[in-house]
């Protein structure tokens, strides 16, 4: 596969990826961080200046939400 | 009008390994993400893993990780599921599928499926 | 992994009968649920998308309803060509998951 991915590619690996569930650009708030100071990664950031497998790419994934309790 | 034209049926040792192929005839192969299905007999649908050719992304269900690999030839439009380290519960049909948008998983156009024998 | 469980796994009814199967997600997977109906020997054909979505070409005594986790689908009057196997699958998040199967068996 090709080394980075970019605008339309880098839109249907997420969906791909995640499903239907959707996907950030940019990790949530503290995703992964613990400064609260530290820079915001993002995906193209990770995935079309540099290159990223898919593991990278499911970090941008949406949360699964809860089921609803009874 | 899309067609996804399996590979024949297989008879496999257990312990040995299976490459069933799946050709795409219709439409435009490289960015639209097929995907695997096994049915055992008399059994539900199991989705093994996906791939979008263009890309060369595939993933993978957990439980077939380091198993199975699926792989494209954009020059025939053809996927691959290759499956190793059979064994008897393995036995089953296998079907490619394949959605309406590069990304779906809304399986408008299966394969004829591949019944793959594992007997020892 | 999200489970998908489908009730009853096994019905009998009649031509002309009205019949509602249901799905239930482990998870949330809001409306991203499909249906898929299976004759012996055949593949699956795409029946219902995105819950209450009808696939182009399918008939429309066939209808979809449900979001969140529970789910069904109704077959309005039931035909002779209906009888199969009916499964449910979320898109919601993979690995893609499928109910066990609703086998629509003749009374």
């Known amino acids: 596969g090709p080394e980075t991915l970019c605008g339309a590619e880098l839109v249907d690996a997420l969906q791909f990826v995640c499903g239907d569930r959707g996907f950030y650009f940019n990790k949530p708030t503290g995703y992964g961080s613990s400064s609260r100071r530290a820079p915001q990664t993002g995906i193209v950031d990770e995935c079309c200046f540099r290159s990223c497998d898919l593991r990278r790419l499911e970090m941008y994934c949406a949360p699964l939400k809860p089921a609803k309790s009874a | 009008q899309v067609q996804l034209q399996q590979s024949g049926a297989e008879v496999k040792k257990p312990g040995s390994s299976v490459k069933v192929s799946c050709k795409a005839s219709?439409?435009?192969?490289?960015?639209?993400?097929i995907s695997w299905v096994r049915q055992a007999p008399g059994q539900g649908l199991e989705w093994m893993g996906g791939?979008?050719?263009?890309?060369?992304?595939?993933n993978y269900a957990q439980k077939f990780q380091g198993r199975v690999t699926i792989t494209a030839d954009e020059s025939t439009s053809t996927a691959y599921m290759e499956l190793s380290s059979l064994r008897s519960e393995d036995t089953a049909v296998y079907y490619c599928?394949?959605?309406?948008?590069?990304?779906?998983?809304?399986?408008?156009?299966w394969g004829q499926g591949t019944l793959v024998t594992v007997s020892s | 992994d999200i489970q998908m469980t489908q009730s009853p796994s096994s019905l009998s009814a009649s031509v002309g009968d009205r019949v509602t199967i249901a799905c239930r997600a482990s998870?949330?997977?809001?409306?991203?649920l499909n249906w898929y109906q299976q004759k012996p020997g055949k593949a699956p054909k795409l029946l219902i998308y995105a819950a209450s979505s009808l696939q182009s070409g399918v008939s429309s005594r066939f209808s979809g309803s449900g979001s969140g986790t529970e789910f069904t689908l109704t077959i309005s009057s039931l035909q002779p060509e209906d009888f199969a196997t009916y499964f449910c699958q979320q898109t919601y998040s993979p690995p893609i998951t499928f109910g066990q199967g609703t086998r629509l068996e003749i009374k």
């Open positions: 791939i979008i050719p263009i890309l060369g992304i595939a």
């Open positions: 599928a394949r959605g309406p948008r590069g990304y779906s998983y809304n399986f408008d156009y």
């Open positions: 998870q949330t997977i809001s409306r991203y």
């Open positions: 219709g439409g435009t192969f490289s960015s639209y993400a």
